[in-house]
């Protein structure tokens, strides 16, 4: 399971239109359910209901994006529609480059998205948790335009990180 | 289907408003950032605005910043564009998009003129 | 604001000919790099995407290509559906940029 270093930035907006560019490091765990490889794009976060729709009309959002999603406390969700590595499928056949899970809640997702597959996802499948995943979270909240950097290896400069 | 129908284009004086619509279906547009984009007549496009899903994040150019206003109404699955001040440069068909430009609308018609 | 180059501004081809029309992005812009075909009177269509990656639908004789900040499109084996303009755009940072459009039409 090796380490995938995320990068997130985030265009903060006045009303006046004017932005301001944060960039915020953290890092996760490329699981085995997907590639390991890099990747990039706006980020889109999803509710895991939200990935429970079945309409074919709904099987292309948009290209290369990132999902995001908040995994909740199994307890909350006894039965879900589909299992996480169905989630993360799901959000790759709607145009995702990408998934990240934080699984702070439901650790046992762990689990679940390293039992190895025979058909692995081509796209990345990471997954964060503690301070990591509410750094992420708090970026992903704050409903401003965010893109994530997806990257196997440190990233080659160091980049100045502001604390969200 | 994606599909995103503009409305609310017309004949309007300069220095006058306009209030543009888009109207999404076919997709969870709550999850998606939009943007309006425009093209003048015979010439390339041009970006106007981007609104990020939840509505807290809007960006602009220059050239319309402090003028028009992006908004939307997920409960409704629509996209605004609200332009005042209107300059005859602003004449141009206005098209929403997904905030990626995958999928476009068939634009609605702005002319500026007295 | 970054500044998207385009060029050239018209391409007369062939039928069966292989064009590469070219976008040269003044700063860094990764992969968000994406191609645009509109025909007249019609909507734009998004032909790639991440710079290399083909848009579904997209016909496989169209593909994208970066080297440095040189971004290309190129189409193989022309066909008289390809004739229209094409847009390049970055959404790497706002303000968001397109080229200013190559009309590739018939020689």
């Known amino acids: 399971k090796e380490t995938a270093f995320v990068e997130v930035v985030l265009f903060e907006s006045s009303p006046s239109g004017d932005y301001t560019t944060y960039t915020t490091g953290l890092t996760g765990r490329f699981s085995r359910a997907g590639a390991t490889l890099s990747a990039e794009g706006e980020i889109v976060q999803m509710h895991p209901l939200g990935l429970c729709n079945n309409n074919d009309e709904e099987d292309l959002y948009e290209y290369g994006w990132v999902g995001v999603v908040k995994l909740e406390q199994p307890e909350l969700d006894p039965k879900p529609c589909l299992t996480v590595l169905g989630k993360a499928k799901r959000a790759v056949q709607r145009g995702a480059t990408a998934v990240i899970f934080d699984v702070s809640e439901n650790p046992e997702a762990i689990d679940q998205l390293n039992q190895g597959s025979e058909d692995p996802l081509k796209r990345p499948v990471v997954y964060v948790k503690g301070a990591d995943a509410i750094k992420l979270m708090n970026i992903v909240n704050k409903q401003k335009v965010a893109r994530a950097r997806i990257q196997h290896r440190p990233p080659r400069q160091p980049t100045e990180y502001f604390d969200m | 289907e994606v599909q995103l129908v503009e409305s609310g284009g017309g004949l309007v004086q300069p220095g006058r408003s306009l209030k543009l619509s888009c109207a999404a279906s076919g997709f969870t547009f709550s999850s998606f950032t939009m943007a309006w984009v425009r093209q003048a007549p015979k010439k390339g496009l041009e970006w106007v605005a981007s609104?990020?899903?939840?509505?807290?994040?809007?960006y602009y150019p220059d050239s319309v910043k402090g003028r028009f206003t992006i908004s939307r109404d997920n409960a409704k699955s629509t996209l605004y564009l609200q332009m005042d001040s209107l300059r005859s440069e602003d004449t141009a068909s206005y098209y929403c998009?997904?905030?990626?430009?995958?999928?476009w609308g068939q634009g609605t018609l702005v002319i500026v003129s007295s | 604001d970054i500044q998207m180059t385009q060029s050239p501004s018209s391409l007369p081809a062939s039928l069966g000919d292989r064009v590469t029309i070219t976008c040269r992005a003044s700063q860094d812009i990764g992969s968000y790099l994406r191609w645009f075909q509109q025909k007249p009177g019609k909507s734009p269509r998004l032909m790639i995407y991440g710079a290399t990656s083909l848009a579904n639908g997209v016909p496989s004789r169209f593909s994208g290509s970066r080297s440095g900040s040189d971004y290309s499109l190129t189409i193989n084996n022309l066909e008289s559906e390809d004739m229209a303009i094409y847009y390049c755009?970055?959404?790497?940072?706002?303000?968001?940029?397109f080229g200013t459009g190559t009309k590739l039409e018939l020689k």
């Open positions: 609104i990020s899903s939840g509505g807290g994040g809007t």
């Open positions: 998009a997904t905030g990626g430009f995958a999928y």
């Open positions: 755009l970055q959404h790497n940072e706002f303000p968001y940029t």
